[in-house]
């Protein structure tokens, strides 16, 4: 067992532009109070489905009336921590919403109104225990800034509240097979061994020994299903054969009505009395309409007024979920090709091609070509989305626009020496060597060491040598 | 002024079921949000279950379990399955769609529930 704390810092406009109207008004002054939900494991789960760890309302805070002409700013907060409590272990991971809500104190016709002003939700890790974690969540053109945390109560102890602590019975050491109890050194672990035979699914202990059920289920070892038609009442006497209710509790210990709902005892059972916004006999419907402003991220809000309309929300680009609060990455389809760069604005998509391609997905294979002179007589040659040239003799360069020097990478070979000419180079060869490149040795008895010549080609040539 | 157009009313008795066309329509639905309104004799319109452009799907609290929506892309068309009807689901049902510029809505078909 423990309890989630949950300690609301601010709301108000979030960064950027766009700030929001102020919720209040001279005319209509109101305050702001908050609720959370909390359900265990990381699921999405819809905003109305239960909230399966527990709910918390907050006290109302301040009354606030906006100033004319001002921004709205951050908004009187009700005083003090919402708290959930939850019975069994904590689950480690789970999700919450926290809404705002906003009371109207105007001249109401049968008392406030209430409205939802902005939903957060996320899903978390957390270990019972720990320091307090801060978080900055936005709803539309809200911010909301807060800190949680869930400790345990004692004499639980854990990460998961489910080790329990007992004072030593011997001042110096903790019994055999035992722990201290950190942080409570002076505690020992408690060997936690219910009654034999105790349902694991429908019981639990706190004391060792003891088979305490879960709701629904009764008897010594809770393997009994609880039904009340063979009871006198509906909190008459009890056995575990029968299988009736335990007397004692009243129909509304442990306050069946979700939602910040009040319960009330009625003759036979209970009934719940329901804010704004939610009904059914626990208040465990959602009843939110577009007058709640359900819509995120600029969506736009499709429905009737009537609390059974449904709604929808037209998402803007780049938002998806029922009410838009998902961010879609959607870069991550790779909707630009041929190794185009996908960012996403927001608004809009966008695809920053590479060199010879170009179209909104970077579709278009240009012609590499097209437009791009090679200078000095060079041709221009394609190839993967980028051009080069084929430059003339004595041209370099991209564009072949540089005069090469032809002598500058040391072309003659054996010492010969380079000149450059208008045809390109000629080499001077060393005494012994000859060919254009003076390749080739001169044997001393003046035969060459020339190779055969090919076909057309007679040996000594002229152009078997340029 | 382009208008959707609804098929599919009728007379029909408690329990039973009908099906609601809206469509072929040269209004493209994918990338709208789209959904079915009905309204009852003296009272508002309201919206009876909707698909947004991205998706999600959403039913009043009286029909859910009862009414089902769909749209058929390719068709261009959208649908509502209505099943175990009640009396006061007796109503004008009205196609509707809508992007962030403009809404379209059709003429309305009657769906009367009697036994």
């Known amino acids: 067992a423990g309890v989630f704390e949950l300690q609301i810092h601010s709301f108000g406009p979030g960064p950027g532009p766009g700030a929001p109207r102020s919720p209040c008004s001279a005319r209509l002054p109101c305050r702001l109070f908050f609720r959370v939900c909390l359900k265990p494991g990381l699921s999405e789960e819809a905003a109305e489905s239960p909230c399966a760890l527990g709910a918390a309302l907050s006290a109302r805070g301040p009354v606030y009336t906006e100033q004319p002409g001002a921004p709205a700013p951050d908004l009187p907060l009700p005083d003090g921590l919402l708290q959930v409590p939850f019975r069994d272990a904590w689950p480690g991971t789970f999700s919450f919403i926290i809404e705002t809500w906003r009371e109207e104190l105007g001249d109401q016709i049968g008392g406030p109104a209430w409205s939802l002003l902005a939903r957060v939700a996320g899903r978390r890790r957390l270990a019972a225990g720990g320091p307090w974690a801060r978080d900055i969540q936005r709803a539309g053109a809200w911010e909301l800034r807060f800190s949680y945390r869930a400790r345990c109560e004692p004499p639980a102890v854990g990460t998961a509240c489910t080790r329990l602590c007992r004072p030593r019975s011997a001042p110096s050491r903790c019994g055999p097979g035992l722990r201290p109890c950190a942080p409570l050194e002076d505690e020992c672990e408690a060997p936690l061994v219910c009654r034999a035979g105790c349902s694991p699914e429908h019981g639990f202990c706190e004391q060792p020994g003891e088979c305490r059920c879960l709701e629904g289920w009764t008897g010594p070892l809770c393997t009994v299903p609880v039904s009340t038609s063979s009871c006198l009442s509906p909190r008459g006497p009890s056995s575990a054969t029968t299988g009736c209710l335990v007397p004692g509790p009243g129909p509304c210990d442990g306050n069946p009505c979700a939602n910040g709902g009040s319960c009330s005892e009625t003759p036979r059972s209970f009934e719940c009395t329901c804010p704004r916004g939610f009904y059914g006999l626990r208040c465990e419907v959602s009843g939110v309409t577009c007058a709640d402003g359900p819509c995120f991220n600029g969506g736009l809000c499709v429905g009737g007024a009537d609390p059974d309309s449904a709604y929808i929300c037209h998402c803007p680009p780049g938002f998806q979920g029922s009410n838009c609060e998902k961010r879609v990455d959607r870069c991550s389809l790779q909707p630009c090709r041929n190794g185009g760069l996908c960012l996403d604005l927001g608004h809009a998509l966008r695809c920053r091609c590479r060199a010879g391609f170009a179209g909104p997905r970077c579709e278009h294979d240009l012609d590499d070509c097209a437009g791009r002179a090679c200078a000095n007589g060079g041709t221009c040659v394609e190839g993967g989305g980028a051009h080069r040239c084929s430059c003339a003799l004595g041209f370099g360069g991209r564009d072949c626009r540089e005069r090469a020097d032809p002598c500058a990478a040391r072309p003659c070979a054996h010492g010969g020496r380079c000149y450059a000419h208008f045809s390109g180079l000629v080499c001077a060869c060393a005494p012994g060597y000859m060919g254009a490149r003076c390749e080739f040795p001169v044997h001393p008895d003046g035969a060459s060491a020339l190779p055969a010549a090919p076909p057309g080609l007679r040996p000594g040539d002229p152009q078997r040598y340029l | 002024e382009v208008q959707l157009v609804e098929s599919g009313g009728g007379e029909v008795q408690p329990g039973g079921s009908l099906r609601l066309s809206c469509g072929p329509s040269?209004?493209?639905?994918?990338?709208?949000?789209v959904g079915w309104w009905r309204q009852a004799p003296g009272k508002q319109r309201n919206l009876v279950a909707g698909?947004?452009?991205?998706?999600?799907?959403n039913y009043a609290q009286s029909v859910k379990g009862r009414f089902t929506i769909s749209r058929d892309n390719a068709k261009n068309t959208l649908y509502l399955q209505m099943s175990s009807l009640r009396a006061e689901d007796t109503a004008v049902y009205y196609c509707?769609?809508?992007?962030?510029?403009?809404?379209?809505w059709g003429q309305g078909t009657l769906v009367t529930v009697k036994p």
């Open positions: 040269e209004i493209i639905f994918s990338d709208k949000s």
């Open positions: 698909i947004s452009n991205v998706g999600s799907t």
């Open positions: 509707y769609a809508r992007d962030f510029e403009n809404e379209y």
